[in-house]
């Protein structure tokens, strides 16, 4: 039993952690920077969609990118519980902490704010400077989506390092792990074409999920061949005319479930990736 | 003056680089295994592809991922002159081989059957297990095209690396290159698209160059809508139905000269980054 | 229903230009569909020449891209071909037609005989 | 290219007989094969796409089968004014034809 509660540990955790990350701003601050030069190129290339089917690829292209960007971005979370491997077990045993105090200490003033910041920072310059869907329901919906993605992504490098005491086997398994989550994105592959034997792959790709969230909240009512009545009933299967049509050939449902069933697996991982560490914590202390 | 010739030297440095890499085979033969790994990982995920527009979206991804794959895992060549850095300054010095000697007795033991097949085996797995274009010319263009790439994006390495004393800084100096680079390649933007003022950048993209003559090879006399009835007056308008027509979306000239081309480049390219690592080692020698 | 008819001079002395012309009835060409040459020689042989699409993009034999030049004029719902460099081996019955890509060619012209000789 | 090949060449047959016209690809077309009919002075008629699908207006006794590299064209009861050349064309890489089938009545 512990002398001091729950809130208090976990309160205490979250101070010294910020109090580093402040403490040494360097990394922060040039994550910051990294995210907004990369934002600006990123929207100088793009600049101003078409629609014709330029404006497909190019709208599919810089989506694809921006949620494998946050995947291998996400990469740098598992130094989180890596670096001060020894000093937590250290603590732990002198009772300073539960290991969920910790745990979500850790994750409150470290993976919270560091993961939100790039979503937020890439929506709010690629979002205007590209020309995407002008709606506000779209604009957060694709900041929550990154967000998402970028969480899921940094819990899965969590899941995989925690209790480790090198950061390069960890980092070597993430990036193989996201080549080939990359290729179930749905970019690089049309995932309607893949055989039944290996299409069950695509459900444990997290940027599947961000990119085909991205891709219904973006091309939902575009018109793609403007000019033509996209009322026609287009008996072609080979024209994409619209972006119903390019989603359907995706095969993406059109159905608002369509879209939020994406943010539920993402978050189902995330749990799921999550209990995975923090039960790696459990046992580290254990066998310590 | 050497009392030995510059063939002797680079016999002997060769011999021994060979050695070295037959004396310690698990390295290549790890290499090898990953490479024939993914290459039937490849050729499952895209088996059999259709002459439709998910063909025309697999086929496109399936070159991008070949060329990408090709530069990043080339990002390793940064050891070749970094590892024995030591070592060559000492038996320089000591008056054993010209730089030269050393410099092109590495090149043909360790880079050039180490970086030549990977290219072989793709090509031989994925060729067939995709069903791409069935010419023997095509095939061996396909095979001497990732060949290309990955000799470039060695030499890039080299250029980079030689003579640095860590790999750290160079593989992420690379690593950074590579990601820009992959951008401008033509598959996540439409290189018609980009604004004038920043598309010249796309020339100084090792993979844009791979991809463009891989899809040259590939696309050219491809027929993507075939049997469509030719009596149904349908609105076929905005469909891509030849592979000319996507490679003249695409800004790709169809001319044979738009196909070689792009080993042209890649071959300059090479010739300018070897020279570049030469004159790095030529200069480390002189502030040793 | 769409109509097809091929018209140009018949004769055409060896290294000049041949020019044909292709009147398009009953569909506008720029509402669809590409726009094909397709030639039979003397022995038979057909040869695809090449297209001009609905959006004026141009594909071409590559066998003849060096001399051969398809375009259109919208107004008058007209696409022609121009073949340069004329030899002998160009003597065939040009016939024009209506398809999407490669595909079967449902609409023809009733085709135009084109000698070349000195 | 392609080449497509049909014999043979000429073929002469009695009215009502069931006939065949070859036609060999130089390398697998994956069904991508059209039949066309064309009388003296005439312009070629589509019979036959995909290699066994019928064109509108194309009476039944016609019909098309095959697939890989070798295909075939069957007029089922020849009739008088099926007398014509017919020609074979491949679309899955380009577009060639064949040198075509000249048939005639016996």
């Known amino acids: 039993s512990y002398t001091t509660s729950f809130c208090h540990q976990l309160r205490w955790v979250s101070k010294r952690s910020f109090k580093n990350l402040l403490g040494n701003p360097q990394a922060s601050i040039a994550q910051i920077i990294v995210t907004v030069i990369l934002g600006l190129v990123i929207g100088a290339i793009y600049f101003g969609l078409n629609n014709d089917s330029t404006g497909i690829q190019n709208r599919a292209g810089v989506l694809f990118f921006l949620t494998t960007n946050q995947c291998f971005s996400s990469v740098s979370a598992v130094e989180l519980f890596v670096v001060e491997k020894k000093l937590f077990i250290h603590e732990y045993i002198s009772g300073y902490y539960r290991v969920s105090s910790y745990f979500f200490g850790k994750l409150l003033s470290d993976l919270l704010p560091m993961r939100m910041l790039p979503s937020i920072i890439f929506t709010c310059i690629v979002y205007f400077m590209l020309g995407l869907k002008p709606t506000a329901d779209a604009f957060f919906i694709m900041m929550f989506t990154l967000m998402m993605v970028a969480y899921s992504a940094s819990s899965m490098a969590l899941a995989i390092a925690a209790g480790q005491s090198v950061v390069s086997v960890a980092t070597l398994l993430m990036t193989i792990c996201f080549v080939f989550m990359m290729i179930f994105s749905g970019l690089l592959v049309n995932l309607t074409t893949i055989a039944s034997w290996l299409s069950w792959l695509q459900y444990f790709s997290i940027p599947r999920y961000g990119f085909t969230a991205l891709q219904h909240n973006e091309f939902l009512g575009q018109n793609f061949c403007p000019g033509l009545n996209a009322t026609v009933n287009n008996t072609c299967n080979y024209a994409t005319c619209t972006g119903e049509e390019y989603l359907t050939k995706q095969g993406i449902d059109l159905s608002p479930w369509g879209l939020w069933k994406n943010h539920v697996a993402l978050a189902c991982m995330i749990v799921i990736f999550l209990t995975i560490a923090y039960l790696k914590l459990l046992f580290l202390k254990k066998y310590s | 003056s050497y009392t030995t010739s510059f063939c002797h030297q680079l016999r002997w440095v060769s011999k021994r680089s060979f050695k070295n890499l037959l004396g310690n085979p698990q390295a290549s033969i790890a290499q090898i295994i990953v490479t024939v790994i993914l290459g039937l990982v490849i050729g499952a995920i895209y088996f059999g592809l259709n002459n439709d527009s998910t063909g025309i979206q697999n086929r496109a991804g399936v070159l991008f991922f070949l060329t990408t794959n090709q530069c990043f895992s080339s990002v390793s060549a940064v050891e070749l002159f970094v590892v024995e850095k030591k070592l060559f300054i000492h038996e320089y010095i000591s008056g054993y081989y010209r730089v030269s000697s050393y410099f092109f007795g590495k090149l043909l033991s360790d880079l050039l059957p180490m970086r030549m097949l990977p290219s072989i085996i793709f090509t031989c797995i994925v060729y067939f297990m995709l069903g791409l274009k069935p010419t023997a010319d095509a095939f061996f263009i396909m095979m001497f095209t990732l060949m290309m790439v990955a000799y470039s994006a060695s030499s890039m390495a080299l250029a980079i690396a030689a003579g640095q004393s860590v790999v750290s800084v160079a593989t992420l100096l690379m690593t950074i290159c590579f990601v820009f680079m992959m951008i401008f390649s033509g598959l996540l933007v439409n290189l018609t698209t980009i604004a004038s003022w920043l598309s010249w950048l796309q020339y100084f993209s090792i993979p844009r160059y791979g991809f463009t003559a891989l899809q040259h090879n590939e696309f050219l006399g491809q027929n993507f809508c075939p049997g469509l009835n030719a009596t149904v007056n349908n609105t076929c308008n905005y469909a891509t139905c030849t592979g000319e027509e996507y490679l003249t979306k695409q800004g790709i000239d169809l001319s044979p000269w738009g196909l070689w081309k792009n080993h042209v480049a890649l071959a300059c390219m090479i010739v300018i980054f070897l020279t570049i690592a030469y004159l790095k080692l030529l200069f480390l020698k002189k502030y040793s | 229903e769409v109509q097809l008819e091929e018209s140009g001079p018949g004769l055409v002395k060896p290294s000049q230009s041949l020019s044909l012309t292709c009147s398009v009835t009953?569909?506008?060409?720029?509402?669809?569909?590409?726009w094909t040459w397709i030639r039979k020689f003397p022995g038979n042989k057909m040869e695809w020449m090449g297209y001009?699409?609905?959006?004026?993009?141009?594909n071409y034999n590559p066998s003849l891209r060096s001399r051969i030049s398809i375009t259109r004029d919208t107004s008058k719902n007209q696409f022609f071909l121009q073949l340069n460099s004329v030899t002998t081996e160009d003597t065939a019955t040009y016939y024009c037609?209506?398809?999407?890509?490669?595909?079967?060619?449902?609409?023809w012209g009733q085709g135009a005989s084109v000698s070349s000789a000195s | 290219d392609i080449v497509m090949t049909q014999s043979p060449s000429l073929l002469s047959a009695s009215v009502g007989d069931r006939v065949t016209l070859s036609c060999k690809a130089g390398?697998?077309?994956?069904?991508?094969l059209a039949w066309y009919q064309q009388k003296l002075g005439k312009a070629p008629k589509l019979l036959i796409y995909?290699?066994?699908s019928l064109q509108t207006g194309i009476p039944s006794r016609f019909s098309g089968s095959g697939s890989g590299t070798d295909f075939t064209l069957t007029i089922s009861s020849l009739q008088p004014e099926d007398v014509a050349t017919y020609f074979c064309?491949?679309?899955?890489?380009?577009?060639?034809f064949g040198s075509g089938t000249k048939l005639e009545i016996k």
């Open positions: 001009i699409s609905y959006s004026g993009f141009t």
């Open positions: 995909n290699t066994n």
């Open positions: 064309q491949q679309y899955n890489s380009w577009t060639t």
């Open positions: 037609t209506r398809t999407r890509g490669y595909n079967p060619f449902a609409y």
């Open positions: 009953g569909y506008t060409i720029t509402s669809g569909y590409d």
């Open positions: 390398r697998n077309i994956n069904n991508y």
